[in-house]
């Protein structure tokens, strides 16, 4: 896990690669393109990262500052209950859903929304500043 010192206050901060935004202990990439949920996941994995797993309300609120009305795919799926890609349950926020076929999770500035996994949307990847660390 990406834990340890608070990099935002340390003297020599590990940096994020080009195109990635640093916040706290992690690097975030907000896509310019649109893909379906599975291809968004594959994009993040191919860049040694993961589709965004949000750990708490604080992280969610801070990320929403960078979002608009447009939804972005995140690492959240409904597989007998809403779970993040690291296996943890969604337990700090509600997700809006209009249909049982909407089994993938997306986020915009207003919150979480279920969507059909085949819809092309923007996405958000998350990784550690250190290349040799795993996210989960």
């Amino acid at each position: 896990l990406c834990q340890g010192s608070n990099y935002s206050t340390c003297a020599s901060c590990p940096s994020c690669p080009d195109r990635w935004m640093k916040y706290g202990n992690h690097c975030y990439y907000f896509s310019v393109e649109e893909k379906d949920w599975n291809s968004s996941l594959e994009f993040c994995l191919a860049r040694d990262s993961h589709l965004l797993v949000i750990t708490d309300n604080q992280e969610m609120s801070l990320l929403q500052v960078f979002l608009s009305e447009a939804f972005c795919w995140i690492g959240l799926r409904n597989n007998s209950g809403w779970r993040w890609e690291d296996g943890s349950p969604l337990n700090f926020s509600r997700i809006s859903s209009n249909s049982f076929v909407q089994t993938c999770g997306a986020i915009n500035k207003n919150g979480l929304q279920a969507s059909s996994c085949e819809v092309p949307l923007h996405w958000v990847c998350k990784k550690c500043p250190f290349a040799d660390q795993a996210l989960f």
């Epitope: 195109r19 893909k35 191919a46 860049r47 040694d48 085949e118 092309p120």
Partner: antibody
Framework: QVQLVESGGGLVKPGGSLRLSCAAS????????MSWIRQTPGKGLEWVAT????????NYPDNVKGRLTISRDNAKNSLYLQMNSLKAEDTAVYYC????????????WGQGTTVTVSS | DIQMTQSPSSLSASVGDRVTITCRAS??????LNWYQQKPGGAPKRLIY???SLDSGVPKRFSGSGSGTDFTLTISSLQSEDFATYYC?????????FGQGTKVEIK
Amino acid sequence: QVQLVESGGGLVKPGGSLRLSCAASGFTFRNYAMSWIRQTPGKGLEWVATISESGNYNNYPDNVKGRLTISRDNAKNSLYLQMNSLKAEDTAVYYCVRDDWEGRAMDYWGQGTTVTVSS
Amino acid sequence: DIQMTQSPSSLSASVGDRVTITCRASRDIGSSLNWYQQKPGGAPKRLIYATSSLDSGVPKRFSGSGSGTDFTLTISSLQSEDFATYYCLQYASSPWTFGQGTKVEIK
């Protein structure tokens, strides 16, 4: 400028193996995911494998899983495709391609190397 | 997998002609479509990405349009160096899939 040069193609019998190589230059190789695409007269252009920047993750279409293995050596700026249990339908020109960083599929292609599977 | 249907499969045209090639996706791909040009004995070269953005060095006579399922590549005034085969590619959904190609020949 970006250059991708493939090698290792040739004639091989069905069931045989072959290892393709791709030498990359003109860009920071370790910062890009890379892929192999093949082209046949019958099936046209077909994606066959992708590997992550570090090489820790790879991805294949179902029809080649278990037979083709993509790998890379970032210290040598090289990409590889190990091809096992080859079939006649694997006969194609194989292209080494760089993945557009923003996710817009492939942006640069090598000139290709020809693999012929025949008895 | 998403099927990409390209038309026509071939066309004959003269230098100076306006040429239009279409590509239809079997489901919505947003604007996640590229166009490639391939000359005999060569590798494909990306001309247009994200439906309508020209790659650097690509002449402005090439343009792309569309969204959702229907896309178009237009060459406003065909030049001798444009005689080649053109392919569309969708990258919205894995696996990436190509159209079958359109061969542009000299009339």
